[in-house]
C-alpha cells in the first residue's frame, strides 16, 4: 500500500477554494481514504472519510472527488478561512 | 444537464481498427473519470476500463488490455476508445458511462453499436 | 473478478403483481446497483447502493439485501416497467454486472 502528496506547499487567497491531491496504491477491495489536517501542536484531526465504493463524500466545507479507477482522492476546502492554514495529510485503511 | 453524445454506428473489416468517441457535456469533464463498457447478447454488460481525463491515467479489465486503449482530449471534453486486431467477436455496442465516485454509473452515453463483418 | 448471477432470468407478471428478482454475488459485497434497460436503450440507474432510488424512478420499486445476496422488489408491476433489469458492483477493482431479468407482461 502507498499513499503518495505531490503538493509539497499551496497558497491560496481567503474566501476561496483549494483542492489538494492524493493519489494511492492499494491491493485491497475495500478500503477508506481518510483526510486529516495537522495543527501546529501535532496533533491530527480528521475531517473526512472516503469509502471504496461510495459516492463522492461530503461534509460542510470539505469535500472529496474520488477518482477509484485511477486511485485519486482529492480534498476540496471552500469558502477558505485563516485557521484552515496548516498541514494536511491523506491516509489509506482498511 | 449532463449529456455523453457517442459516435455513430460502424461497420468494419476484421483485423482493422476503430476509435469510437464520446463528448461530454453539462460538467467538467476533468472532474470525473470516463467508463466503457461493452454490451452483447452473449456476455451481457462487461466493463472496459477507464481513464481519468484530468492525469490520462487509465485502468482495463483484464480480458481487454491490447483489445481497447482509452484517451481523453481535455480541450474537445471528448474521450476515446480504440479498438485494435477486430474479430467478430467484437462486434457489440460500445458505451461511454461516467461514475459517481466508487458506486455506481450515473449517466450513460446513447451507445454505438459496431458490426465486425468482411 | 466478482461474478453476479440474477435470477430468474424472464420474469412473467401480471399487472398489479408483487415480482421480485435476485442478484446473488460470488464473494460477498457492501453494495449492489440495479439498472434498467428497455430495448434500443442505454442502461438507466435505477437503484443505487443496495436501496436508494434514483431520481424519478417510482416508489412501487425498492431494493434490499447484504453480503451475498442481493434483491428487486416492485410492489404493484405495472405495463412501463417492462424491462431487464441489472445488478452491478464495484467492490473489487474490476466492476461486474450480471446477465440480467428480464421482465415480461403478461
Known amino acids: 500500500q502507498k499513499v503518495t502528496q505531490a503538493q509539497s506547499s499551496v497558497s491560496m487567497p481567503v474566501r476561496k477554494a483549494v483542492t489538494l491531491n492524493c493519489l494511492y496504491e492499494t491491493s485491497w477491495w475495500s478500503y477508506y481514504i481518510f483526510w486529516y489536517k495537522q495543527l501546529p501542536s501535532k496533533e491530527m484531526i480528521f475531517l473526512i472519510r472516503q469509502g471504496s465504493d461510495e459516492q463522492n463524500a461530503k461534509s460542510g466545507r470539505y469535500s472529496v472527488n474520488f477518482k477509484k479507477a485511477a486511485k485519486s482522492v482529492a480534498l476540496t476546502i471552500s469558502a477558505l478561512q485563516l485557521e484552515d492554514s496548516a498541514k494536511y495529510f491523506c491516509a489509506l485503511g482498511e | 444537464q449532463v449529456q455523453l453524445q457517442q459516435s455513430g454506428a460502424d461497420l468494419v473489416r476484421p483485423g482493422a481498427s476503430v476509435t469510437l468517441s464520446c463528448k461530454a457535456s453539462g460538467y467538467t469533464f476533468t472532474d470525473y473519470e470516463m467508463h466503457w463498457v461493452k454490451q452483447t447478447p452473449v456476455h451481457g454488460l462487461e466493463w472496459i476500463g477507464a481513464?481519468?481525463?484530468?492525469?490520462?491515467?487509465?485502468a482495463y479489465n483484464q480480458n481487454f488490455k491490447g483489445k481497447a486503449t482509452l484517451t481523453a482530449d481535455k480541450s474537445s471534453s471528448t474521450a476515446y476508445m480504440e479498438l485494435s486486431s477486430l474479430t467478430s467477436e467484437d462486434s457489440a455496442v460500445y458505451y461511454c458511462?461516467?461514475?459517481?465516485?466508487?458506486?455506481?454509473?450515473?449517466?450513460w452515453g446513447q451507445g454505438t453499436p459496431l458490426t465486425v463483418s468482411s | 473478478q466478482i461474478v453476479l448471477s440474477q435470477s430468474p432470468a424472464i420474469l412473467s407478471a401480471s399487472p398489479g403483481e408483487k415480482v421480485t428478482m435476485t442478484c446473488r454475488a460470488s464473494s460477498s459485497v457492501r453494495y449492489i446497483h440495479w439498472y434498467q434497460q428497455k430495448p434500443g436503450s442505454s442502461p438507466k440507474p435505477w437503484i443505487y447502493?443496495?436501496?436508494n432510488l434514483a431520481s424519478g424512478v417510482p416508489a412501487r420499486f425498492s431494493g434490499s439485501g447484504s453480503g451475498t445476496s442481493y434483491s428487486l422488489t416492485i410492489s404493484r408491476v405495472e405495463a412501463e416497467d417492462a424491462a431487464t433489469y441489472h445488478c452491478?458492483?464495484?467492490?473489487?477493482?474490476?466492476?461486474?454486472f450480471g446477465a440480467g431479468t428480464k421482465l415480461e407482461l403478461k
Open positions: 452491478q458492483q464495484w467492490y473489487s477493482d474490476t466492476p461486474t
Open positions: 458511462t461516467r461514475p459517481r465516485g466508487g458506486s455506481h454509473f450515473d449517466h
Open positions: 447502493a443496495t436501496s
Open positions: 481513464i481519468d481525463p484530468e492525469t490520462g491515467i487509465t
